[in-house]
């Protein structure tokens, strides 16, 4: 058993049918010595008396808010949560496996640049009685500071019969140098509590591996005289690290017909312009990627050919 | 993804082309190592990230773009003195900081070159003959060093009398390639920045 926060405790259980569970001793936070009784949650049934209460915690029915009273007055509370260990592996019931970029990916994180700011998000089908708390650091043995905000509900989607909820959090490394070569990964730890179930999820990454630039901005077409060709031009996104001559991007320009089946013409360039043939009803899209370290491509920025 | 091949203009900063080749070569070598050594811990998540140049050179700090010198987190002021005569420097633009930067890059390359050559000698003794260093990568390191053209003491190749542990050598190869790739990215950024200056 360990303390998650004041008066909230997590009991770690080896989870299998007929498991013996864990013996837990609760102590009433009071100078009083006698006349103390204990109850669980809203029940008025007295579970025991005395300054300490010994319980065998086996299942969720044994978890909850234990309260010690004296003469009708509440003295203190202890909330017991359960953390299930199933055959050597901690349970992952609360969050959905996003399966990207690989199986057992519960937390996904992205950064728009090298400033040390990043966003993480996760999915769940649970709508109520759910709380998250997020901590982060650079490295784990001698951790350096990363400050995370509060997790917020960022999107709701309908998936088949189920509703899916996306939560996200923004974090900022306290003293980040965009040009630094990372040798210690960022660690992100999310504590999730659903009713009386506790779970924790972690992700470890280098900022360089989670870079995903914003799409190029100011995408414009300039027709070339007496030609079906157009000059496409764009700019680096505002959120990208500066100077651009140091943090360079490479670009992919795509001409896509109205139908998804039509052949796509693609050109790769390090410049912020390209000459392409504009077909009728086609659209031109441009996306960006770090020129020197191949992390994710940005989303497409698009303009119609007409 | 294959990096686009740049054809240098005659007046172009001479080292940019070589640094692009370097990044391409080390990226290819790392990919090959990860595929060949699939049963070894060779991915970024599995290895310890060690920098053999730590406390010996200060490339990131010495080559910091002017715009980032205002960022206190970037100023780890590790003062290292270097020889300052490089052929990559167009003499009118020569500045002490730029010379310091390029000589730091040269020292990095020299250290990695020695490590890779020592390691290759060990790998050639492996009866499994599983993996060797790409000669192209070693040649590209050499070309960039020549383009930088700094006079510096030659570092003797380390020789080891004891029987090599091939498992450890292959893991060390992965660690070295990951670190060198990161340094090659920095070198490419620096050359691109200097080229634009």
């Amino acid at each position: 058993i360990w303390e998650l926060k004041k008066d909230v405790y997590v009991v770690e259980l080896d989870w299998y049918p007929d498991a013996p569970g864990e013996m837990v001793v609760l102590t009433c936070d009071t100078p009083e010595e006698d006349g103390i009784t204990w109850t669980l949650d809203q029940s008025s049934e007295v579970l025991g008396s005395g300054k300490t209460l010994t319980i065998q915690v086996k299942e969720f029915g044994d978890a909850g808010q234990y309260t010690c009273h004296k003469g009708g007055e509440v003295l203190s509370h202890s909330l017991l949560l359960l953390h299930k260990k199933e055959d050597g592996i901690w349970s992952t019931d609360i969050l959905k496996d996003q399966k990207e970029p690989k199986n057992k990916t519960f937390l996904r994180c992205e950064a728009k640049n090298y400033s040390g700011r990043f966003t993480c998000w996760w999915l769940t089908t649970i709508s109520t009685d759910l709380t998250f708390s997020v901590k982060s650091s650079r490295g784990s043995s001698d951790p350096q500071g990363v400050t995370c905000g509060a997790a917020t509900l960022s999107a709701e989607r309908v998936r088949g019969d189920n509703k899916e909820y996306e939560y996200s959090v923004e974090c900022q490394e306290d003293s980040a140098c965009p040009a630094a070569e990372e040798s210690l990964p960022i660690e992100v730890m999310v504590d999730a509590v659903h009713k009386l179930k506790y779970e924790n999820y972690t992700s470890s990454f280098f900022i360089r591996d989670i870079i995903k630039p914003d799409p190029p901005k100011n995408l414009q077409l300039k027709p070339l005289k007496n030609s079906r060709q157009v000059e496409v031009s764009w700019e680096y996104p505002d959120t990208w690290s500066t100077p651009h001559s140091y943090f360079s991007l490479t670009f992919c320009v795509q001409v896509q017909g109205k139908s998804k089946r039509e052949k796509k013409d693609r050109v790769f360039t390090d410049k912020t312009s390209a000459t392409v043939i504009c077909r009728k009803n086609a659209s031109i899209s441009v996306r960006a990627q770090d020129r020197y370290y191949s992390s994710s491509w940005s989303e497409w920025a698009s303009v119609p050919c007409s | 993804r294959n990096l686009p091949v740049a054809t240098p203009d005659p007046g172009m900063f001479p080292c940019l082309h070589h640094s692009q080749n370097l990044l391409r070569a080390v990226s290819n070598m790392l990919q090959k190592a990860r595929q060949t050594l699939e049963f070894y811990p060779c991915t970024s998540e599995e290895i310890d990230h060690e920098d053999i140049t730590k406390d010996k050179t200060s490339t990131v700090e010495a080559c910091l773009p002017l715009e980032l010198t205002k960022n206190e987190s970037c100023l780890n002021s590790r003062e290292t003195s270097f020889i300052t005569n490089g052929s990559c420097l167009a003499s009118r633009k020569t500045s002490f900081m730029m010379a310091l930067c390029l000589s730091s890059i040269y020292e990095d390359l020299k250290m990695y070159q020695v490590e890779f050559k020592t390691m290759n000698a060990k790998l050639l003794m492996d009866p499994k003959r599983q993996i060797f260093l790409d000669q192209n990568m070693l040649a590209v390191i050499d070309e960039l060093m020549q383009a930088l053209n700094f006079n510096s003491e030659t570092v003797p190749q380390k020789s080891s009398l004891e029987e090599p542990d091939f498992y450890k050598t292959k893991i060390k190869l992965c660690i070295l390639l990951h670190a060198f790739r990161i340094r090659a990215v920095t070198i490419d950024r620096v050359m691109s920045y200097l080229n634009a200056s």
Partner: antibody, heavy 115, light 112 residues
Framework: QVQLVQSGGGVVQPGRSLRLSCAAS????????MHWVRQAPGKGLEWVAF????????YYADSVKGRFTISRDNSKNTLYLQMKSLRAEDTAVYYC????????WGQGTMVTVSS | SYVLTQPPSVSGTPGQRVTISCSGG????????VKWYQQLPGTAPKLLIY???QRPSGVPDRFSGSKSGTSASLAITGVQAEDEADYYC????????????FGTGTKVTVLG
């Protein structure tokens, strides 16, 4: 004590269907994940499928994906394996099993796919 | 296809020490627990070892399990006639958990 009693095995022709059941008692069935494991005659153990305690997630071996469906009825304390498009290579003893460090197995039920 | 490899058979005379190996990889045994089962003919498998080296109550202490790196082993010290059975190791793969990965199985024969 924990008990898992299996039923539903038998002889079936290729291409036909069969449903296996596993009735649980002696524990809170709705709190635990469950597996199906099979063993072809004279062969080793092969995992078939898993279902979460609440039925929210199901996992299948590639060899049965799209043909077999694992399900549970927590109000009846019963686990099921619906097998469709059966093949000769599905012939095996099928076991249900609880998930956890200490597990309990059903007695097994024989499924024979033969024309 | 089996990812955990065991020897097809091992044998020993009563009182001898018999060991069965179970060889896997970094993504399974290397990063997950190992269990061992004993299966007597015509019966369901019986748990012998869980959590690499833990014995459930009721399992004789002549059975012991260990794990090192990407391999595990089961030792029977002082093998007895009633130990003649098939033995299976089991683990998980970190990418496909909770799918069970079973070893190929080892037939233990007690001679004499």
């Amino acid at each position: 004590q924990v008990q898992l009693v299996q039923s539903g095995g038998g002889v079936v022709q290729p291409g036909r269907s069969l449903r296996l059941s596993c009735a649980a008692s002696g524990f809170t069935f709705s709190s635990y994940g469950m597996h199906w494991v099979r063993q072809a005659p004279g062969k080793g153990l092969e995992w078939v499928a898993f279902i979460r305690y609440d039925g929210s997630n199901k996992y299948y071996a590639d060899s049965v994906k799209g043909r077999f469906t694992i399900s549970r009825d927590n109000s009846k304390n019963t686990l099921y394996l619906q097998m469709k498009s059966l093949r000769a290579e599905d012939t095996a003893v099928y076991y249900c099993k609880t998930h956890g460090s200490h597990d309990n197995w059903g007695q097994g039920t024989m499924v024979t796919v033969s024309s | 296809s089996y990812v955990l490899t065991q020897p097809p058979s091992v044998s020993g005379t009563p009182g001898q020490r018999v060991t069965i190996s179970c060889s896997g990889g970094r993504s399974n045994i290397g990063s997950n627990i190992v269990k061992w089962y004993q299966q007597l003919p015509g019966t369901a498998p019986k748990l012998l070892i869980y959590g690499n080296d833990q014995r459930p109550s009721g399992v004789p202490d002549r059975f012991s399990g260990s794990k090192s790196g990407t391999s595990a082993s089961l030792a029977i010290t002082g093998v007895q006639a009633e130990d003649e059975a098939d033995y299976y190791c089991q683990s998980y793969d970190r990418g496909t958990h909770p799918a069970l990965l079973f070893g190929t199985g080892t037939k233990v024969t007690v001679l004499g």
